[in-house]
């Protein structure tokens, strides 16, 4: 009896794993084996496909074959017993085009109200993605174990932190990779679950701001309790995108280790030009807070985007504010050669109720004030460039009293 050639051959490629599956043509014939040949583009001869010779099952793995993943390849299969079937040719394919991205590896760290997610490609040093390894982005689905309501987060990198979670709650998530340059979406990782910890008695520091004074950076933050020590760490922002890079390690700022105030001062030359992330942690000697939310810090912008300087002319029912260029050390004005908008905050000295004005002009009127009342004003500058999207810190507050009634002219 003539053997029929196998049919319906499927090629599955996940990362560097090449799997072939096929159907037997004749289930009634026993002890049949199967063999594959392959042919590269521009070649006439067929070569035996190692790992896929004399296979008794309907699946084989040819991952060991060192192929150019961008080069088209053709396969053929036949059945063998005493005699052989005719060859069945599989449509030619390019491995890279056919490949799927495998499930990434995921490592989770729990805080009380946040989870840190570290993601790395499932196949280390993959041949398939050798040219694209740094272009991976990831997306994840997260849900509370108790509710199952899913939230999707797109376009994250190899380290991501999810905030505003509940303490002592189990969250589950799964992650998949994508190569947007090749329009490839990967396979989800297994589900990983982690329980957030009990609420930390020490909250993380908040409202971290960087300003420039003379040749130094001044880092300030807010903290709930007194008699604490703080440490500050930094990281190159671009390293967050680079999975497994050993430079991706938070480093101490020496002048900000174990400081006992809610600020620290360090020389500008600590950082070369670039964009950094900064974070702060508090300790009372016995306990340690979790890390603060990270702030982005761009040395280029930070060096130039200083808080505005302004003068106030007081009337009975308004202030006229004249904004000038900020002063650098030595009282020389700084030339800001990009358009700015100004945020002006003012409040009655005896009240906490703040009002805000956003203005592009450098002369601003603050209307609807009460006569003979002390008002305080502070201002900051924002770049109008969407790409930069930076803000200076607020200027120091200036307080002035409005004039008596009927002096509005």
């Amino acid at each position: 009896k003539n053997l029929k050639s196998p049919q319906k051959v499927e090629v599955d490629i996940i990362d560097d794993n090449f799997i072939l599956r096929w159907n037997r043509s004749d289930e009634s014939v026993g002890n049949v084996t199967f063999s594959f040949d392959y042919q590269k583009t521009g070649m006439d001869n067929w070569i035996k496909l190692s790992g896929c010779q004399n296979i008794t099952s309907t699946k084989c793995n040819f991952s060991s074959l060192k192929l150019n993943v961008y080069e088209e390849i053709k396969l053929r299969i036949r059945a063998e017993k005493e005699n052989t079937s005719s060859w069945y040719e599989v449509d030619s394919f390019t491995p890279f085009r056919k490949a799927q991205i495998g499930p990434p590896e995921v490592h989770l760290e729990a805080e009380d109200k946040a989870i840190v997610i570290h993601i790395s490609p499932g196949t280390k040093d993959s041949v398939m993605w050798a040219l694209d390894g740094l272009s991976f982005t990831y997306s994840l689905v997260i849900w509370k174990n108790s509710s199952g309501v899913e939230e999707r987060i797109e376009n994250i990198y190899s380290r991501h932190k999810i905030y505003k979670l509940s303490p002592e709650t189990t969250y589950c998530l799964k992650v998949k990779a994508a190569l947007l340059t090749s329009w490839k979406i990967g396979v989800y990782s297994p589900v990983h679950c982690i329980k957030t910890t009990v609420e930390n008695e020490l909250p993380p520091p908040e409202n971290i701001e960087v300003s420039v004074q003379n040749q130094n950076y001044v880092l300030k933050w807010d903290y709930t309790y007194a008699n604490m020590t703080f440490q500050v760490q930094w990281l190159h922002a671009f390293l967050k995108r680079n999975p497994g890079n050993h430079l991706y390690k938070w480093k101490q700022i020496p002048d900000c280790e174990n400081v006992k105030t809610t600020q620290c001062v360090f020389p500008q030359n600590v950082f070369q030009k670039g964009i950094y992330l900064l974070r702060v942690q508090a300790s009372d000697g016995n306990n340690t807070s979790f890390w603060s939310e990270e702030i982005k810090f761009d040395t280029e912008i930070q060096a130039f985007l200083l808080p505005p300087v302004f003068n106030i002319r007081s009337l009975s029912d308004s202030f006229h504010i004249y904004i000038g260029a900020p002063k650098q050390s030595g009282n020389t004005p700084v030339i800001q050669d990009y358009p700015l908008i100004y945020e002006i905050i003012f409040w009655e000295n005896t009240s906490n109720a703040e009002r805000k004005i956003i203005e592009k002009k450098t002369d601003v009127t603050v209307p609807n004030l009460k006569p003979l009342t002390v008002y305080c004003v502070k201002a900051r500058a924002h770049t109008m460039d969407e790409k930069l999207n930076k803000s200076s810190v607020f200027s120091d507050a200036v307080c002035e009293k409005t004039k008596p009634g009927n002096t509005s002219k």
Epitope: H107, E109, A110, E111, D112, V116, H118, K124, R159, I194, K195, T197, V198, N200, E201, G244, N245, H246, L247, Y248, K249, W250, N286, N287, T288, W291
Partner: antibody, heavy 123, light 107 residues
Framework: QVQLQQPGTELVKPGSPVKLSCKAS????????LNWVQQRPGRGLEWIGK????????RYNQKFKDKATLTVDKSSNTAYIQLSSLTSEDSAVYYC????????????????WGQGTSVTVSS | DIQMTQSSSSFSVSLGDRLTITCKAS??????LAWFQQKPGNAPRLLIS???SLETGVPSRFSGSGSRKDYTLSISSLQTEDVATYYC?????????FGSGTKLEIK
């Protein structure tokens, strides 16, 4: 698979130093902290310190700061602990153990251990 | 330094027993707790990290629980191969510290 290889025994004279090795394989050596742990005969485990093989940052247990010096040789994926001025109190098994990823936000557990080197201080 | 206290230094147990070993930290350690098993002449083996996560290859009869300062290791049905000394260890705060160990002996 992850392996940490340590020599089995070292016999040292009192007052002498000794340098113990720990050769790592099966993982990216520069991506994980490398810990050292002491276990004296019939006693429990005591953490000596840890080193980041990527940049040789070290965290010591203050108790061992003057006794132990941690180093690494990245080219051979080997970590070392040098113990100085040995006394009978230093007779113990010294283990190396892989710690958490150096790029994690918080410390991780020691998941892989060497078999330990037994140090005997005797004249 | 954070002190780790294992209340029982030894347990006399029968095969098939359910067993719970407790560990108390002197400060809150936010689930940064590991459990190790050590047999004579061998290195410690990590059983559980993060207070509750079973390591790959560890039998499912082992489980961990707890939070804040109090943690437990449970063995649902004791087997001969479980006879060993068990240590807890905190890795929240440097220096990392171990409990003094709990030794299991067969009755």
């Amino acid at each position: 698979q992850v392996q940490l290889q340590q020599p089995g025994t070292e016999l040292v004279k009192p007052g002498s130093p000794v340098k113990l090795s720990c050769k790592a394989s099966g993982y990216t050596f520069t991506s994980f902290w490398l810990n050292w742990v002491q276990q004296r005969p019939g006693r429990g485990l005591e953490w000596i310190g840890k080193i980041d093989p990527s940049d040789s940052e070290i965290r010591y247990n203050q108790k061992f700061k003057d006794k132990a010096t941690l180093t690494v040789d990245k080219s051979s994926n080997t970590a070392y602990i040098q113990l100085s001025s040995l006394t009978s109190e230093d007779s113990a098994v010294y283990y190396c153990a892989r710690g958490g990823g150096i790029y994690y936000d918080y410390d991780g557990a020691m998941d892989y251990w060497g078999q330990g080197t037994s140090v005997t201080v005797s004249s | 330094d954070i002190q780790m206290t294992q209340s029982s230094s030894s347990f006399s147990v029968s095969l098939g027993d359910r067993l719970t070993i407790t560990c108390k930290a002197s400060e809150v350690i936010y689930n940064r707790l590991a459990w190790f098993q050590q047999k004579p002449g061998n290195a410690p083996r990590l059983l559980i990290s993060g207070a509750t996560s079973l390591e790959t290859g560890v039998p499912s009869r082992f489980s961990g629980s707890g939070s804040r300062k109090d943690y437990t290791l449970s063995i649902s049905s004791l087997q001969t191969e479980d006879v060993a000394t068990y240590y807890c260890q905190q890795y929240w705060s440097s220096p990392f510290t171990f409990g003094s160990g709990t030794k299991l002996e067969i009755k």
